[in-house]
Structure formats: C-alpha cells, structure tokens
C-alpha cells in the first residue's frame, strides 16, 4: 500500500502536487509498512478494541488563516477515556480517585510503555531495532526521552505526508509560501505503541485555509459604551480602534505596516503606521468603516526580464526590479545587462488586508459627577446605619438606571451593590440615597446607565461615627 | 396639566388577549419613564410593568412575566400593554402612571374583566 | 402578602396626629426612596411623598415623610375628615427588580 491509499481520500492532481511542495515533507505515492502499521477502514470492529477503556479522541487545531508565505501550525491533542492520562514517562495512567463505568481500577497503568521497551529485544548498539520506525521505513529521531514518546502522528496535505513521534500533543508548522491559496485539507492519522508494533487509535481532519490577504480584526473600545460587541457607540466621544493582525509565525515583524482608515463621516482618510487610532463621531446615524492595511512582505520575485535590445538603457526596468527587489542595484554605468538577478535575492510583495463594518452613533450618557454629599438625619435614638444621599449631575442621554456599588477603602471588596430605575429631568440632576452600616472609610462607585451607555464615577467616603456633631467627608 | 388617559379595557375571557392605551399630555412624554400598576376589586395596588423613556429598558411584575408586553410610541405620547393568555386574577383596574421610581401622576384607570 | 409590611388601618381625631409605618429591608426600603400614595374612595391613587421626605406641590404640609433603616413612616398632623382614605407606601425592590407596595391601610377619621 501507499501513503495515499492509506492517509486520504482527496487526491491532488499532479500540477497541486508538483506546486506545492513542502519543506521536509515527502510524497505520498511512497509504501507504507502495513506489518508495523495496519490500516483499519472506518466502521472496522477493531477500532472498539484501539484503547483500553474507551475510545481516544484528537483534536486538531491550527492557526489558519495564514498569510501566504508565513508559517501554519497544526497542534493535535489526545484526549483520553475519563480518568485517563499521561504520566512524566509518558505511560498512561488512571487518575487517582477517579471513577468511572468500571470503577476505581488496581492497576495504576492502562498502557506501560516503560515497562514494554525495556522488555524489548533486538536492539543494536545503537538502540535502534526493526520496529522503532515510521511507517515509510524510516528511523525515529532519538531525541532524549524519545522513549517515552509513544504516539506516531502522520500529518497528511496537498499529497505529501509528514511523520512525528510524540506524546499526547503534538505541533507540526509548515512554511506556506508554495501552497496554493484558498481552503486546504489537514489529516492525521494517530498510532500508538503496541509491543512491537502500532495501532491506529484516532484520525481527524480539519480544513485550513492560506491566503494573500493580511488577515485583519478590528477591536474597538469607548467609554461609557454598554455593550462594545454591538457596534453601537456614542456620540462626542472617542472611540478607540485597534487593529490586530492575524499573523501568528511573526511572518510581518520586519515589514512597515500602514493603516488607511475611512470612517464613513466625511472627514476624509487617514493614513497611519499605529495600529490604534482615536476617531469621535459628532453626528448621530449609521456609518461605513473601512480600514486598508498594506505590508510589504517577503514575496515571490518577479520573473527575469527578458534579455533587453542593446540599445540605450530603460530605466523603468530599473525601477520595476527595484519596486519588488530592495537589494537590486541600480544600472551599473549605461550596460541594461547589468540589471541580471542576483541570487537568493530577497523579494517583496505589497500585501494587503481590508476590514469594513457598518457602526451606528447614538446619545449616550457623556459624564456623571458627584457634586453633593449629604449625611440625612435620622429620628433619635441613632441607629446603626447612616442614610447618605449623593446629589449626581450628568451630562448626554437621560439616564434610566442608577447602580450604586459600596466597596472597602481599596475599592476591591464589593460590600453592597444597589441598582434602581431613575427618573431624571432634562437638567439631569438627581439625588441618590443609600445605607451605609457602621462608620468607616467607603468606595462608592456609582454608575448611570441607559439603553447604550453606563457612565461610571468613584469616590471615597468617610463615614462619621453617629454623633450629631460629626460632619460627613468626601475622603477625597 | 399632565393628563394620562387609559382605553382599551372591557371583559374578555380567560386566554383571550386585550391591548391597553394611555394617551398622555401636558408633559414632554419621550422624557419620562411609563408604568402600568392595576387594582383588583377590593384589594390594593400592584405594580404591573414599566418602560424607560426611550422603550430600550422594561420591567415586568413575575406575576405577568411572558403574557404582557409594554411599548410606548414616543411620536403618538402613547403608551400600550399589550395582555394576552389572560386570567381571572388578571382582573383589575388598570392605571397608567408617568415615571418608575415613583408615580407622580395616574389616569383615571379602565377596568379588566376576565371572566367566562 | 406583600414585600412591604403597612397596618391594616389607623384611626384618629379630627386635629389629632396619626402615623403609619412601612417596613421592608434593605433591598426596597433601606436602598431606595419610598413615596407614599393616597386613594381616596373611588378614585385613582395620588401621590403624596415622594424620595422620602419631598412633597410634590399641592399637598399640604400636614403630610410629612421620614425613613429610618428598613422602615419608613407617614405621619399626618391635624387631621382632616378629608384625609380618610386608603394609603399605600411603595420602593422600587432591587433584588426583585420590581416596583412593590405595601398592603394598604385604611384611615378613617373618628
């Protein structure tokens, strides 16, 4: 049998294949040892008896969207029966205390590799034997603690295949500059050690995908929005956007970046190379953002010019080599020959990536302060509580809740929280009351909030002892 | 002078639907918080619902929580409750009431009757 | 039963001095303003106090609002035979999210 009799139903046609190649990774038209490896259909019987306890999943994950000719990691984790799980030595073991269908179990291993490897035989001086081998023949690595490595993973794309020896997670990157773009197929097949030989205990698939546009996300923040996730803001004040670019190999940490934003309220484009910007709507409505970002990115180069007439140089060749090439020299006196590629050339390539989303502006509650404090007298004798009432003046929308959250000194201990409707005049001046038991130094955050925003202030408050004659303080 | 006036009451039988008005005026209506608040004969107040100034915030009594609905149409200074699955113990006088953290003005109320 | 604890009745003297308590707890009462609402026979409710101890205007000062922890009081000084009449104290329950008033308590003026 072969690799892709074995890993994959889709079958790349010969031009895929031959154009994207992977660094490191081999075809799949090579044998696969089916002796050391056996290979079970889906739906074959045996896969029920592939674990003890129950059946491994794995997940796999990756990175994707990647940047043409950045880096894609895939990371796949095993993820065993209940009460299962990996031990230092790489052997799995029930978790102590652990219950499941069968019970507490007396052994303490369900799979001792350990104990497996050094009953081994046939092993040479170097440690090597028959059987510790990949399924196309060839030998593990022996990195240190190879040993306790007892998952084979087989990583197959685009007709090429990719072997692993690992525990229960793996992460395997390849360089994406020679695939081609759009979505793609990652399988992998997982084996386990078994004596002398291997059995599959899970397959999965995911689809990744490459791309030649900066994958672009935009998070904004304002404050005083309520809810940042509805792309509802206020109106007069600003909103920060920043943008965060999908590029997880760092493939773009030595270009220069440029943001060109357009808010959609006729204050023109803006060019910028910071990934934040503050921009303040001053009308209310709906309103298209977009966002261009460029990059230049290491790339392709150009194909050779053809060899040019001699006749008098042409400096838009020149200029051409240059746009791609920053390592191009200029024409060497007047010969156009000169202009010949230089090897290992490092080319670059404008990528770009766009984001647009449609914002709407609405009132929102601006500001909120507290002006006044009043300590609000009580019939005698005393009680313990003190009655406070905060005079609180705000500025935008008509709050109509008030939320009052007392907390310690250090404003990090929540004592009391009290939220209400308000009912506040166009002025929006209003008075706030609440308990506060016993004396002591008070946070008092007090928040008014409407439909869209949730304005916030803080104070400190010192609370007197009950005696008529102690004033109340702001401790601030 | 604030006036508030409700319509829309009359008998229905229990799991039919009514829906409540209240023209209000004499105050700028898409300022204030609404309420709703209903009386059974013979017994006292109970508050029903309420709505902010602009319909983006409401609250409901549990006792009417999934079977009434509260809106307000800021260009008409209307307010509505809109009743349905009805009960006999829905039966009351409803009045209409500007404001939420207190109610400084009632209508005159229109009587519900659930009955078969 | 209600969240907010008012007498059954109360009863006085034309001149005389009559309060009626309202209890509750610190998530209606102990938190938040209480008003005071009078219905007279066959009426709709009025609003008597209101933000404990505010007098919306046309009420006369013979009606006076006090708080004191979780417990709230109407106190009505020279009593009238025109005060006779149902009263109700009312707070917005922050725990409940609910507007509650307390069972009613029927004034009559001897």
């Known amino acids: 049998k072969r690799f892709h009799d074995v890993l994959g139903n889709e079958r790349p046609s010969a031009y895929m294949r031959e154009h994207n190649q992977l660094n490191g990774w081999s075809s799949d038209e090579n044998d696969w040892n089916e002796k050391l490896y056996p290979v079970w259909k889906r739906g074959d019987m045996r896969w029920k008896n592939s674990w003890k306890g129950g059946r491994v999943q794995a997940v796999l994950t990756s990175d994707s969207p990647a940047l043409v000719g950045s880096n894609i990691t895939f990371a796949v984790n095993l993820i065993f029966p209940r009460c299962q799980k990996e031990d230092a030595n790489g052997n799995i073991v029930y978790e102590k205390n652990c219950r499941n269908e069968a019970g507490l179990s007396a052994d303490p291993y369900v799979y001792n590799w350990t104990a497996w490897s050094e009953d081994s035989d046939g092993e040479n001086g170097t440690g090597q034997s028959h059987h510790n081998v990949f399924p196309d023949g060839k030998p593990f690595p022996h990195h240190p603690g190879w040993r306790r490595w007892n998952f084979i993973y087989v990583f197959h794309t685009l007709g090429q295949y990719f072997q692993k020896l690992g525990r229960c997670s793996v992460r395997v990157s390849v360089n994406t500059a020679n695939v081609t773009l759009g979505p793609q197929l990652m399988e992998v097949t997982v084996y386990r050690r078994h004596g002398r030989a291997y059995v599959p205990i899970a397959q999965v698939k995911d689809v990744y995908v490459v791309t030649d546009q900066i994958p672009v996300f935009v998070t904004m923040f304002q404050k005083n929005d309520r809810n940042s996730s509805d792309e509802t803001f206020l109106k007069d004040l600003p909103i920060m956007f920043d943008v965060l670019i999908h590029d997880p190999s760092h493939f773009l940490n030595y270009s220069t970046i440029n943001y060109k934003w357009s808010f959609g309220d006729n204050t023109g484009l803006f060019v910028s190379t910071n990934h934040t910007v503050n921009h303040t709507y001053v009308l209310n409505g709906t309103f298209s953002l977009n966002l261009t970002v460029k990059a230049a990115a290491p790339g392709p180069c150009p194909p050779p010019p053809p060899p040019p007439r001699p006749s008098k140089p042409t400096p838009s060749l020149a200029t051409t080599l240059k746009s791609y090439d920053s390592n191009t020299p200029g024409p060497a006196g007047d010969n156009p020959l000169e202009l010949s590629r230089i090897p290992d050339e490092n080319c670059q390539i404008n990528r770009y990536g766009h984001f647009q989303a449609t914002i709407t502006i609405v009132e929102g509650i601006l500001e909120v302060n507290i002006i006044q404090m009043t300590d609000v007298l009580m019939p005698v004798p005393w009680p313990e509580s003190s009655l406070i009432d905060f005079v609180v003046t705000c500025q935008g929308s008509i709050p109509t809740e008030v939320c009052t959250i007392i907390s310690d000194p250090t404003c990090e201990i929540t004592q009391n929280t009290v939220c209400s409707p308000v009912d506040v005049d166009e002025m929006c001046l209003l008075t706030v009351r609440r308990t506060f038991n016993g004396s002591g130094t008070y946070c008092v955050n007090l928040t008014l909030g409407d439909d869209t925003s949730l304005a916030l202030t803080s104070t400190l408050i010192s609370v007197p002892d009950r005696d008529p004659a102690s004033p109340l303080r702001m401790a601030n | 002078e604030v006036q508030l006036l409700e319509s829309g009451g009359g008998l229905v039988q229990p799991g039919g639907s009514l829906r409540l008005s209240c023209a209000a005026s004499?105050?700028?209506?898409?300022?204030?918080?609404m309420s709703w608040v209903r009386q059974a004969p013979g017994k006292g107040l109970e508050w029903v619902s309420s709505?902010?100034?602009?319909?983006?915030?409401?609250y409901y009594a549990d006792s009417v929580k999934g079977r009434f609905t509260i809106s307000r149409d800021n260009s008409k200074n209307t307010l509505y409750l809109q009743m349905n699955s009805l009960r006999a113990e829905d039966t009351a006088v409803y009045y209409c009431?500007?404001?939420?953290?207190?109610?400084?003005?009632w209508g005159q109320g229109t009587l519900v009757t659930v009955s078969s | 039963q209600s969240v907010l604890t008012q007498p059954p009745s109360a009863s006085g003297t034309p001149g005389q001095r009559v309060t009626i308590s309202c209890s509750g707890s610190s998530s209606n009462i102990g938190n938040n303003y209480v008003s005071w609402y009078q219905q007279l026979p066959g009426t709709a409710p009025k609003l008597l106090i209101y933000d404990t101890p505010l007098r919306p205007s046309g009420v006369p000062d013979r009606f006076s609002g006090s708080k004191s922890g979780t417990s709230a009081s109407l106190a009505i000084s020279g009593l009238r035979s025109e005060d006779e009449a149902d009263y109700y104290c009312?707070?917005?329950?922050?725990?409940?999210?609910?507007?509650v008033f307390g069972g009613d308590t029927k004034l009559t003026v001897l």
């Open positions: 009431a500007r404001k939420w953290s207190t109610f400084d003005y």
């Open positions: 709505i902010s100034h602009s319909g983006g915030s409401k």
């Open positions: 004499g105050f700028t209506f898409s300022n204030y918080a």
């Open positions: 009312g707070a917005w329950d922050s725990s409940l999210n609910a507007y």
